[in-house]
């Protein structure tokens, strides 16, 4: 086909000789044809159409990519001739850097729907060169990691040695989708979530007297996990005293947040302190009530069949522990004023007498 009518874009890939990095070309088809072939995600800010016939990427027809040999030979089908270059919908991924990637790349729709579509193509002139050794040593990596739950930032490798003030306007894409919120050389992330993982592309324009080039870099961002540096945090009970009714059943819940640990051995126990005695109570198993990638909330309840006078003199202690350390929360029971009748008190005293006998034969010291 005749490529003279293709729109042209010039791109520069300055790769680091010290690291493995990838490169991506987007098939920036002119409107309105682009909307037939590429997902909205590949559009630049000025190219977003009112309507896209395909909203789900699985419905999208592909584009065909070619490479134009410098000697004027016929166009080469990239899939057949270049195993290190991968075609994926509307993008072309270069797995390995090298000056041999320099050349002209043409994309056009695979399915021609109208005579006008024949001229619907983009020619990308790609220049690939190693980064000069003069460029700064601490340039950002093409593989960047963000720690889940913390703050972080993604830096554009080709601009990471420049201050924000010096930096030109940058266009960012994530997984091919334009990120219109930021135009600086760094994306600041207030709190890292899994969705921040992906392939980021940063573009800026470099002009000389002769022409204008888009300088592009690709960053693979991973969200990573790490062990907490904090002891578990008791969320409930919050108060150190709890109003109760004598003779009535009572459940005290202990809820604690445990930060992520690769080897997770949470400990959650209930103790009772009575004068100089202290013992662990046999209570139902702890259960996880909320689990995320950065922490887990665990609950364990202590159940009293009926609150007795003796219970009012005791301290109920929730103890939680991880590999960093432990936290405790004590709860003292306090009788609700004006609650319960004479029968309740007699009943409670009867339970207390039975309980005294039971504890004398069963309690043990906790060290």
């Amino acid at each position: 086909f005749n490529i003279s009518g293709c729109s042209t874009k010039k791109l520069l890939w300055a790769y680091s000789t010290r690291s493995e990095e990838e490169f991506i070309l987007f098939c920036d088809l002119p409107e309105p044809q682009k909307s037939h072939f590429c997902h909205r995600s590949q559009l630049s800010p000025t190219q977003v159409p009112d309507h896209l016939p395909f909203t789900d990427s699985k419905d999208l027809p592909d584009v065909q990519w070619y490479r134009q040999p410098s000697n004027g030979d016929p166009l080469e089908d990239i899939r057949k001739s270049y195993p290190h270059i991968i075609q994926d919908k509307c993008t072309l991924r270069f797995l390995t850097p090298g000056v041999n990637n320099t050349g002209s790349y043409i994309c056009r729709p695979k399915m021609i729907k109208s005579p006008y579509d024949v001229a619907c193509c983009v020619k990308m002139i790609l220049e690939v060169k190693p980064q000069s050794n003069a460029s700064c040593e601490n340039s950002a990596s093409h593989k960047q990691d963000l720690l889940l739950g913390s703050t972080g930032s993604i830096s554009c490798p080709s601009l990471s040695c420049q201050s924000d003030a010096q930096s030109p306007e940058v266009t960012w894409y994530k997984n091919g989708k334009l990120l219109s919120m930021t135009r600086s050389n760094r994306i600041v992330v207030d709190e890292v979530y899994i969705y921040h993982q992906g392939t980021y592309v940063c573009d800026y324009t470099q002009s000389d007297t002769a022409s204008s080039w888009t300088v592009r870099a690709v960053v693979q961002v991973r969200t990573i996990v790490g062990d907490t540096k904090l002891k578990p945090d008791i969320l409930d009970p919050v108060e150190s005293t709890l109003e109760v009714e004598l003779g009535k059943p009572l459940t005290i819940s202990c809820k604690a947040r445990f930060g992520f640990e690769r080897v997770f051995n949470p400990v959650m126990k209930w103790y009772i302190k009575d004068a100089d005695l202290e013992w662990e109570v046999s209570v139902p198993e702890a259960k996880s009530i909320k689990s995320t990638l950065k922490d887990e909330i665990i609950e364990r309840n202590i159940i009293l069949e009926k609150v007795t006078q003796r219970d009012l003199r005791r301290t109920f202690v929730c103890f939680v522990q991880n590999s960093i350390g432990n936290t405790t929360q004590s709860v003292q029971l306090k009788e609700k004023r004006g609650s319960g009748g004479l029968n309740d008190i007699f009943e409670a005293q009867k339970i207390e007498w039975h309980e005294t006998v039971r504890f004398q034969s069963h309690h043990h010291h906790h060290h």
């Epitope: 990596s141 990691d145 990573i224 996990v225 790490g226 080897v263 960093i324």
Partner: antibody, heavy 124, light 107 residues
């Protein structure tokens, strides 16, 4: 760009303590786990243990009684000490960055950056 | 400890061949398996994680599959630089363990 470099004596006497240090350059030691792995001559790989930059550790039970891994974040280094060595501890010792990659509802751990390895011979 | 058994222990193949290496776990490990490539005198290089996810920069001729106890590493068309020893590694439970390795040689 992260690079790891093991250092330490290449020869250790039996019953003594093997001490190695891994220096991390081109990146921070923070936020990552750091592992030690060894490979006896002509054999496969054996994981020794890891340390998180905050200091939490996990060791291979088969070596636990003899192993200590520590970290010095100010120097961007982590170290291995293996006590009471015998000829069976002769191996190439590697340090590696151990990453927990989060994806959907689980994690995948991989050793994505390795040192070039240092040979340690246990002999009198 | 979970044992990983690789087969074959060694194999000879030619450039352009399709090669499959298997790794069997002594108990179910979900998809918590990684593959590494090691060349003589060099440190291992990480290729695949989560049984089938390719590390960025690793050629697409490498692929991994499997879940539970049976896993495979496939090289669709061998290149000269692929001749090396390959190790599988499980992260499902501690201690972390490696397979004994599969040595891939030029025929």
């Amino acid at each position: 760009q992260v690079q790891l470099q093991e250092s330490g004596p290449g020869l250790v006497k039996p019953s003594e303590t093997l001490s190695l240090t891994c220096t991390v350059s081109g990146g921070s030691i923070n936020n990552y786990y750091w592992s030690w792995i060894r490979q006896p001559p002509g054999k496969g790989l054996e994981w020794i243990g890891y340390i998180f930059y905050s200091g939490t550790t996990n060791y291979n039970p088969s070596l636990k009684s003899r192993v200590t891994i520590s970290v010095d974040t100010s120097k961007n280094q982590f170290s291995l000490k293996l006590s009471s060595v015998t000829a069976a501890d002769t191996a190439v010792y590697y340090c590696a960055r151990d990453v927990g990659i989060a994806a959907r509802n689980s994690y995948y751990y991989v050793m994505d950056v390795w040192g070039q390895g240092t040979t340690v011979t246990v002999s009198s | 400890a979970i044992q990983l058994t690789q087969s074959p222990s060694s194999l000879s193949a030619s450039v352009g061949d399709r090669v499959t290496i298997t790794c069997r776990a002594s108990q179910g490990i979900s998809s918590a398996l990684a593959w590494y490539q090691q060349k003589p005198g060099k440190a291992p290089k990480f290729l695949i994680y989560d049984a089938s996810s390719l590390e960025s920069g690793v050629p697409s001729r490498f692929s991994g599959s499997g879940s539970g106890t049976d896993f495979t590493l496939t090289i669709s068309s061998l290149q000269p630089e692929d001749f090396a020893t390959y190790y599988c590694q499980q992260f499902n439970s501690y201690p972390i363990t490696f397979g004994q390795g599969t040595r891939l040689e030029i025929k």
